[in-house]
């Protein structure tokens, strides 16, 4: 089990590092988006895992962004961002097979309404129970 957890961490960390770099190979990314969305978590250790991903990064002082799958829908009533940005992107999470282009990548400010827990604990718990 420890070996499985280590392998899972390695795969996830690699997926985060390479997020958005190859529009033709998005299965792992979309699967991880789905995990974050379902487990209500963000990143492996912490949301800050995402800050090194250049394709998500904002300019200058607004650098810190995370994928829309980290967005906590239940913590906001900001209908503008929900209707225009988040919901169209999250609706794709049920259709993981569809390929994605880098222009489709959806990112939100990490200081807004996001899941603040990393996914490691939730996934480890799930592994222990299965």
């Amino acid at each position: 089990r420890a070996q499985l957890e280590r392998s899972l961490r390695d795969v996830v960390e690699k997926t985060i590092q390479k997020y958005g770099t190859n529009p033709e190979e998005t299965a792992a990314e979309e699967s991880w988006d789905y995990v974050q969305f379902q487990l209500r978590c963000c990143g492996w250790h912490y949301p800050q895992d995402w800050f090194q991903v250049l394709i998500l990064r904002g300019n200058g002082s607004e650098a810190h962004r995370v994928p829309c799958s980290c967005y906590n829908l239940s913590a906001t009533n900001d209908s503008t961002i929900l209707d225009k940005v988040i919901l169209p992107q999250l609706s794709r999470l049920g259709h993981l097979a569809r390929s994605r282009h880098s222009a489709d990548i959806c990112a939100v400010p990490a200081e807004s309404h996001i899941y603040r827990e990393g996914c490691a604990q939730g996934l480890q718990k799930w592994l222990h129970n299965n």
């Epitope: 800050q48 990064r57 650098a63 810190h64 906001t76 400010p109 990490a110 200081e111 807004s112 603040r116």
Partner: antibody, heavy 115, light 107 residues
Framework: QVQVQESGPGLVAPSQTLSITCTVS????????VSWVRQPPGKGLEWLGV???????NYHSSLKSRLSIKKDHSKSQVFLKLNSLTAADTATYYC?????????WGQGTLVTVSS | DIQMTQSPSSLSVSVGERVTITCRAS??????LAWYQQKPGKSPKLLVN???NLADGVPSRFSGSGSGTDYSLKINSLQPEDFGTYYC?????????FGQGTKLEIK
Amino acid sequence: QVQVQESGPGLVAPSQTLSITCTVSGFSLTTSGVSWVRQPPGKGLEWLGVIWGDGSTNYHSSLKSRLSIKKDHSKSQVFLKLNSLTAADTATYYCAKGGYSLAHWGQGTLVTVSS
Amino acid sequence: DIQMTQSPSSLSVSVGERVTITCRASENIRSNLAWYQQKPGKSPKLLVNVATNLADGVPSRFSGSGSGTDYSLKINSLQPEDFGTYYCQHYWGTTWTFGQGTKLEIK
């Protein structure tokens, strides 16, 4: 443009509670974090805590039991409360826009703890 | 909590010279690091975030680098207005800390 301004009491007696208000403009408290940092006279910076866009908070581990950060969206204000003050809490207290890196700082308010 | 150790604690440098300030974290902070400049009697100013990303309006003579536990801030061709105290700050985990500061004086 972004503006951040602290207002505090100046002088507080030992064992009392410090209350500081940070009034912001030029950005939304729903999408940005606001952090608090203090600096004792002649010393370095000490991170105190942050309140995120969703209202959740992170606190300095050694101040957790004494520190509270809240906000009022309608007034664009963030509030810091620090209780059971001692002379070691004498410092300039800053609020800043940003939860991770702190991009815009207020001018700071000097708080002296003394009887 | 993660400790941040800056070096040197102070330095005196001539205008036009190159300066390097380093910051070491007590554990891997995965590039979640910012640098600030503070002048006497003033509020700190953000220079760099995510270890290498220059903040808005910061001159290109400033640059950040590093990964893991070791980070540095370089100032190419020091200008008179660059004096002050420089601080690093990590934001990995759930509580952040600053380095103790590096005081930069113009020779």
